[in-house]
């Protein structure tokens, strides 16, 4: 079966946008006006995985780049990275588990839980200009809530 991908942008609950910081890192900061064009556009693919009404498995690639957010162990800690893939083979319906996030909608916010590491979430810091990372706590200092803006292809 073909995998369907839709383009979108993300903002954290403090309205920080996500931008590239070097070739393999994302950071979160407040953008306004024309600077909004700097924000990363994701290609979100609906992939195979455990699904419910509030939880949808997705993969988050960078639009028109062969880079996907993935979750791996580094020094025994679940870590978020941008991983380069072969564009001939991705995206695909059966993505490897490290690429899969459970998109969970709670009230008017979205969370992205790692399928590989349950209870670890795509997170941003309260501080400006800090890397996007995989965090193991919800409801603390770090931000795990996002809104999504779909955009035309």
């Amino acid at each position: 079966a073909p995998v369907r991908s839709l383009n979108c942008t993300l903002r954290d609950s403090q309205q920080k946008s996500l931008v590239m910081s070097g070739p393999y890192e994302l950071k979160a900061l407040h953008l306004q006006g024309q600077d909004m064009e700097q924000q990363v556009v994701f290609s979100m693919s609906f992939v195979q995985g455990e699904e419910s009404n509030d939880k949808i498995p997705v993969a988050l690639g960078l639009k028109e780049k062969n880079l996907y957010l993935s979750c791996v162990l580094k020094d025994d800690k679940p870590t978020l990275q941008l991983e380069s893939v072969d564009p001939k083979n991705y995206p695909k319906k059966k993505m490897e588990k490290r690429f899969v996030f459970n998109k969970i909608e709670i009230n008017n916010k979205l969370e992205f839980e790692s399928a590989q590491f349950p209870n670890w979430y795509i997170s941003t810091s309260q501080a400006e200009n800090m890397p996007v990372f995989l965090g193991g706590t919800k409801g603390g200092q770090d931000i795990t809530d996002f809104t999504m803006q779909f955009v035309s292809s």
Epitope: L6, I56, E105, N107, N108, T147
Partner: antibody, heavy 119, light 107 residues
Amino acid sequence: EVQLVESGGGLVQPGGSLRLSCAASGFDFSRYDMSWVRQAPGKGLEWVAYISSGGGSTYFPDTVKGRFTISRDNAKNTLYLQMNSLRAEDTAMYYCARQNKKLTWFDYWGQGTLVTVSS
Amino acid sequence: DIQMTQSPSSLSASVGDRVTITCRTSGNIHNYLTWYQQKPGKAPQLLVYNAKTLADGVPSRFSGSGSGTQFTLTISSLQPEDFANYYCQHFWSLPFTFGQGTKVEIK
């Protein structure tokens, strides 16, 4: 029985604003994504706004982006469309529609509310 | 954006006729296509989704087929209540655009 009832349409001058409402009943509103679709007189259908079940995701095509906002109140089972900087070309029947979970087809539609933008 | 081209834009047919409406897309949308029926002064109603799955309550005289870039909606034996406008819509990539419609009139 699924029911969607739109209201709030009317005559508005170019540059003006209008807020449409859609009252939903007969299903668990908080579990469904919703959209607004419009139809200019004698013309075809155009999808103009989308919101996910909890309100965390939205979409607007380029024709209305920056002018229209969509919101919902799940406690009141109501969907809204705030339309600002209205233009003559926004004149249309506006339908609210219930949408399948993963941004797909519209399985139920309201009867529509007419918006006329004219001086 | 994926462009949707419906043909014919209108047709005249008699009760009992077999009617076929075609929808072509500018890009491959696999089976991500829907058909709606709209009667004058009424809201559209879902007929077919995923190119060929009949929506609940839709009579079996309606059928959908096709994949990729070419799709058809067929009414095997036209009934008086079938005189209406028909629209296709894709939901493969944003924006999900509609065809311009096909008006089915009484001959």
